[in-house]
Interface confidence: low
């Protein structure tokens, strides 16, 4: 199709070579007067559309993305051509940074239903550069955490080294929706709830004498609870003795609850005490059986192929540990009577 009628937008992605980061392009279709696809509700200057970008189709996946090869070859369909670029509804996700992402990206509706729709497309010229500004050593991360229940803020990585006074007007999006009131390089959250989690995009305009560009950065925001102040607790076994049948196989399960830690290195292991000797047992891998915002329950089993008389003299000890401390629970086997 002829892309000469597409509206054009220039974007700049300056990525940090120190961190993994993502990037997004929105299919921000314009408003031809008679196109149902690109139609936007008529808004007074004070109103804000519910969705920006792309409000036309009921099904937001009804757009097609293409890349325009620099050598003049025909347009290439993004869906099949680029493994690190994923289309999610009307958004194009770039999963890895790199100058090879530079180029022209075109989006348009999949279904052309009227002659007016033919020109209903956007051409985005994306320039990708590695960050060279070494003076800003502590620029905000592209992965930011907010502590639930407290005050927090989300900083625009490309502007975090500028003071609020110097900062240009910023346009923020959360999960593809315009955050209309936010205009500064930092979003302040009075009280953090789990719904503050998501993908935030900050845009600002940079101009030179020739043209203007939209500088964009993407921030993945995670809402977290504070690191636990407690050592893990053992939920099972509860009893310190266990009735068993000699000669039969036996599985003893150790289940422990670990509180949330940002750097999470849980330890859960079984060892055996026999008079003065003590040794760790080779047992199946631990597995997480429940994971919530605040804690994780991890289980690890010890398996005896056959309970022997010797096992009755031993203590089976489950040991669990996090960065705060450790807990143990021992089990003595007792032969079942009659």
């Amino acid at each position: 199709f002829n892309i000469s009628g597409c509206s054009t937008k220039k974007l700049l992605w300056t990525y940090s070579t120190r961190s993994e980061e993502e990037f997004v392009l929105f299919c921000d279709l314009p408003e031809p007067q008679k196109s149902h696809f690109c139609h936007r509700n008529r808004l007074s200057p004070k109103q804000v559309p519910e969705h920006l970008p792309f409000m036309g189709s009921n099904d937001l996946s009804d757009v097609q993305w293409y890349q325009q090869p620099s050598n003049g070859d025909p347009l290439e369909d993004i869906r099949k051509s680029y493994p690190h670029i994923i289309q999610d509804k009307c958004t194009l996700h770039f999963l890895t940074p790199g100058v090879n992402n530079s180029g022209s990206y075109i989006c348009r509706p999949k279904m052309i239903k009227s002659p007016y729709d033919v020109a209903c497309c956007v051409k985005m010229i994306l320039e990708v550069k590695p960050q060279t500004n070494a003076s800003c050593e502590y620029s905000a991360s592209h992965k930011q955490d907010l502590l639930l229940g407290s005050t927090g803020s989300i900083s625009c990585p490309s502007l975090s080294c500028q003071s609020d006074a110097q900062s240009p007007a910023v346009t923020w999006y959360k999960n593809g929706k315009l955050l209309s009131v936010e205009r500064s390089n930092r979003i302040v959250v009075d009280e953090v709830y789990d719904y503050h989690q998501g993908t935030y995009v900050c845009d600002y305009t940079q101009s030179d004498t020739v043209s203007s560009w939209t500088v964009r950065a993407v921030v993945q925001v995670r809402t977290i609870v504070g690191d636990t102040k407690l050592k893990p607790d053992i939920l099972d076994p509860v009893e310190d003795t266990l009735e068993v049948e000699l000669g039969k196989p036996l599985t003893i399960s150790c289940k422990a609850r670990f509180g949330f830690e940002r750097v999470f290195n849980p330890v859960i292991k079984w060892y055996i005490k026999d008079s003065d000797l003590e040794w760790e047992v080779s047992v199946p891998e631990a597995k997480s059986i429940k994971s919530t915002l605040k804690d994780e329950i991890i289980e690890r089993n010890i398996i005896l192929e056959k309970v022997t008389q010797r096992d009755l003299r031993r203590k089976f000890v489950c040991f669990v540990q996090n960065s705060i401390g450790n807990t143990t629970q021992s089990v003595q086997l007792k032969e079942k009577r009659g």
């Epitope: 099949k80 493994p83 690190h84 994923i86």
Partner: antibody, heavy 118, light 111 residues
Framework: SVEESGGRLVTPGTPLTLTCTVS????????MTWVRQAPGKGLEWIGI?????NTYYASWAKGRFTISKTSTTVDLKITSPTTEDTATYFC????????????????WGPGTLVTVSL | AAVLTQTPSPVSAAVGGTVSISCQSS????????LSWFQQKPGQPPKLLIY???TLASGVPSRFRGSGSGTQFTLTISDVQCDDAATYYC???????????FGGGTEVVVK
Amino acid sequence: SVEESGGRLVTPGTPLTLTCTVSGFSLNNYGMTWVRQAPGKGLEWIGIINIIDNTYYASWAKGRFTISKTSTTVDLKITSPTTEDTATYFCARADYYPDTTGWYLNIWGPGTLVTVSL
Amino acid sequence: AAVLTQTPSPVSAAVGGTVSISCQSSKSVYNNKWLSWFQQKPGQPPKLLIYGAFTLASGVPSRFRGSGSGTQFTLTISDVQCDDAATYYCAGDYSSNSDDAFGGGTEVVVK
């Protein structure tokens, strides 16, 4: 490498989850598919989970299977198995080739056998 | 859903000879070429032979050749070896992922 586990004998209607454990590569970079093969029959494509966790299923498999993943595993849940679901279930990595534009199942696990019987 | 119909099984081939297996799709595969071929031996997982209708996968001998476009594809094995005795499957990738499918398979018997 890719390895499936969790296959066993189940009764009809008992949900079963198969796990595909990967090593040597990251699930952040590859899509993963599930394929099955009934005894003595051909291969059937079940579905794929891509790098941003979007799942796509063969039209016959929608509602019957659920694919999900963690950082190193991909699960296939058979929601309500019937005797027709008796098969070897394979997990395969979807590779992308730079010189073409499509995904192909290049690395396969040995498979895990599921038997659904009363 | 798309249906991929393969040459009926079994197909016989003599050592040193040539064998061709066809695969017909009920609709065009994506970009007319997103079709791959696999070889499977009993008790083993499938092995990728060809992707993109005609590109040879890494480590596959050049005796295997893929051709075709759109809805009609062929796998040709020349200078057939005993080790080529297996079942061969085609697999189509379509613009809608829910259409992706395998063919029914063709068993090649080497005499």
